[in-house]
Interface confidence: low
C-alpha cells in the first residue's frame, strides 16, 4: 500500500491531523524533500549571525556573521570573535602568539614556526608573530658553483625578528 | 508567558450537559492545535479530540465522538468541549494542553490546570 | 486504535539509583513517542518526544530511547522530586493513545 504522505512535494507536509493531506509549510517554515510529515522551522540569523539567503518553503535560511566574527561548524553553526593576525583566541579573549609560534589569519590558533633544520635547510627569512619562517636551500646547496642564490645573511635557529 | 486557564469545578446529574472552557492566553491562539484529556479517579490519560482555532478543524477518538464536542471563539481565545448525556463514567479531570501545528513532532507543552466534573445523582 | 503497555505499572526505587520504564506498542510507531510526568494533582508535563528528544529545561537524567515497537524512558539517577506516574504516548496515528502509567516512588 503507497504511503499518502509519498504524494506532498517539498514545500509541503503530509498533515496526519487533516487525514494524510498535504499541507503547506506555514510561515517560517520548510520543507526541501517531498513526502515530509513535519516542516521544520527556519533558521532565524540573530544577534551575531546575520542572513545570507532567505528561507523559503522550500529551503532553510542560510547565515553568516556579522563584520568581526568568522563562521565555526557545518553550515556555519557557530560564530568566534575575529582575532588580529598574530594572535589567537583564548578564553580571556585574543592573545599575542608566544615566542616561536605565529598565526597568519584572523582565525585559529598560533602554530610553530617551521623547523628548516629538519628539511636540512637553512632560514631564509626570520620568522614573526604574523609569518613562519621562510626555509632557504640546504647549505649543501650553497657550495662554491652549486648555484647562483646569495647566501642569506647568519640567522638564528629558529628564525626570530625582535617583538 | 503562555497560559491556558480552565473553567471551575462542575457537579452534574445524570443526563445533563456541561460546557467546559479553557482560555489561552501568551500566543498566538490560531496557530495552535488545543486538544483535551480526560483522566478518570485513579486512572490514565485518555485523548478525546483536538480542534484548530484557525478554522475550526476537529479530530475526534471515536470513543468521545457521541459524548464531546470541541468548538472554539477565536475572539476571547477560548476553546471548549461539551459533554452530553453525562453519566457517572464522566467523572474525571479534564485538561486542555495545546500542541503545536506539525502533528508529527507533536509535544503537549501546556497545559491547563484541568475542571473536575463530578456526575452524581 | 494502537495499544501501548507500559511496564512495569509501579516500581520502587533507592535515590541515585537508575530507573528504567518500558512502553511497547501494538505496531510499529516509527519514532513517534513521548513520555510524560505527572505528580498527584498536577497536570502532566512533556519530558521527551520523538522516542528520544528532551524538551527544553527537562533535567539530562532523563532520557529516551528506541523506535518501531519498543521504548523506554531512563532516569540515571533518581531524585526526590522524579517521584510521579509516568506515561508514554504514541502520536503515530490518531487517536493518540497513552500507555498506562508507571507510578515511580522512593525505597
Known amino acids: 500500500l503507497q504511503d499518502p504522505c509519498s504524494n506532498c512535494p517539498a514545500g509541503t507536509f503530509c498533515d496526519n491531523n487533516r487525514n494524510q493531506i498535504c499541507s503547506p509549510c506555514p510561515p517560517n517554515s520548510f520543507s526541501s524533500a517531498g513526502g515530509q510529515r513535519t516542516c521544520d522551522i527556519c533558521r532565524q540569523c540573530k544577534g551575531v549571525f546575520r542572513t545570507r539567503k532567505e528561507c523559503s518553503s522550500t529551503s532553510n535560511a542560510e547565515c553568516d556573521c556579522t563584520p568581526g566574527f568568522h563562521c565555526l561548524g557545518a553550515g556555519c553553526s557557530m560564530c568566534e570573535q575575529d582575532c588580529k593576525q598574530g594572535q589567537e583566541l583564548t578564553k580571556k579573549g585574543c592573545k599575542d602568539c608566544c615566542f616561536g609560534t605565529f598565526n597568519d589569519q584572523k582565525r585559529g590558533i598560533c602554530r610553530p614556526w617551521t623547523n628548516c633544520s629538519l628539511d636540512g635547510k637553512s632560514v631564509l627569512v626570520n620568522g614573526t608573530k604574523e609569518r613562519d619562517v621562510v626555509c632557504g636551500p640546504s647549505p649543501a646547496d650553497l657550495s662554491p658553483g652549486a648555484s647562483s642564490v646569495t647566501p642569506p645573511a647568519p640567522a638564528r635557529e629558529p628564525g626570530h625578528s625582535p617583538q | 508567558q503562555v497560559q491556558l486557564v480552565q473553567s471551575g469545578a462542575e457537579v452534574k446529574k445524570p443526563g445533563s450537559s456541561v460546557k467546559l472552557s479553557c482560555k489561552a492566553s501568551g500566543y498566538t491562539f490560531s496557530s495552535y492545535w488545543i486538544n483535551w484529556v480526560k483522566q478518570a479517579p485513579g486512572q490514565g490519560l485518555e485523548w478525546i479530540g483536538n480542534?484548530?482555532?484557525?478554522?475550526?478543524?476537529?479530530n475526534y477518538n471515536q470513543k468521545f465522538k457521541d459524548k464531546a464536542t470541541l468548538t472554539v471563539d477565536k475572539s476571547t481565545s477560548t476553546a471548549y468541549m461539551e459533554l452530553s448525556s453525562l453519566r457517572s463514567e464522566d467523572t474525571a479531570v479534564y485538561y486542555c494542553?495545546?500542541?503545536?501545528?506539525?502533528?508529527?513532532?507533536?509535544?503537549?507543552?501546556?497545559w491547563g490546570q484541568g475542571t473536575t466534573l463530578t456526575v452524581s445523582s | 486504535d494502537i495499544q501501548m503497555t507500559q511496564s512495569p505499572s509501579s516500581l520502587s526505587a533507592s535515590l541515585g539509583e537508575r530507573v528504567t520504564i518500558t512502553c511497547k506498542a501494538s505496531?510499529?510507531?516509527?519514532?513517534?513517542l513521548s513520555w510524560y510526568q505527572q505528580k498527584p494533582g498536577k497536570a502532566p508535563k512533556t519530558l521527551i518526544y520523538?522516542?528520544?528528544r528532551l524538551v527544553d529545561g527537562v533535567p539530562s537524567r532523563f532520557s529516551g530511547s528506541g523506535s518501531g515497537q519498543d521504548f523506554t524512558l531512563t532516569i540515571s539517577s533518581l531524585q526526590p522530586e522524579d517521584i510521579a506516574t509516568y506515561y508514554c504516548l504514541q502520536y503515530d496515528e490518531l487517536p493518540p493513545t497513552f500507555g498506562g502509567g508507571t507510578k515511580v516512588e522512593i525505597k
Open positions: 480542534i484548530y482555532p484557525s478554522d475550526s478543524y476537529t
Open positions: 505496531q510499529d510507531i516509527n519514532s513517534y
Open positions: 494542553t495545546r500542541t503545536w501545528e506539525f502533528y508529527y513532532d507533536s509535544v503537549f507543552d501546556y
Open positions: 520523538r522516542a528520544n
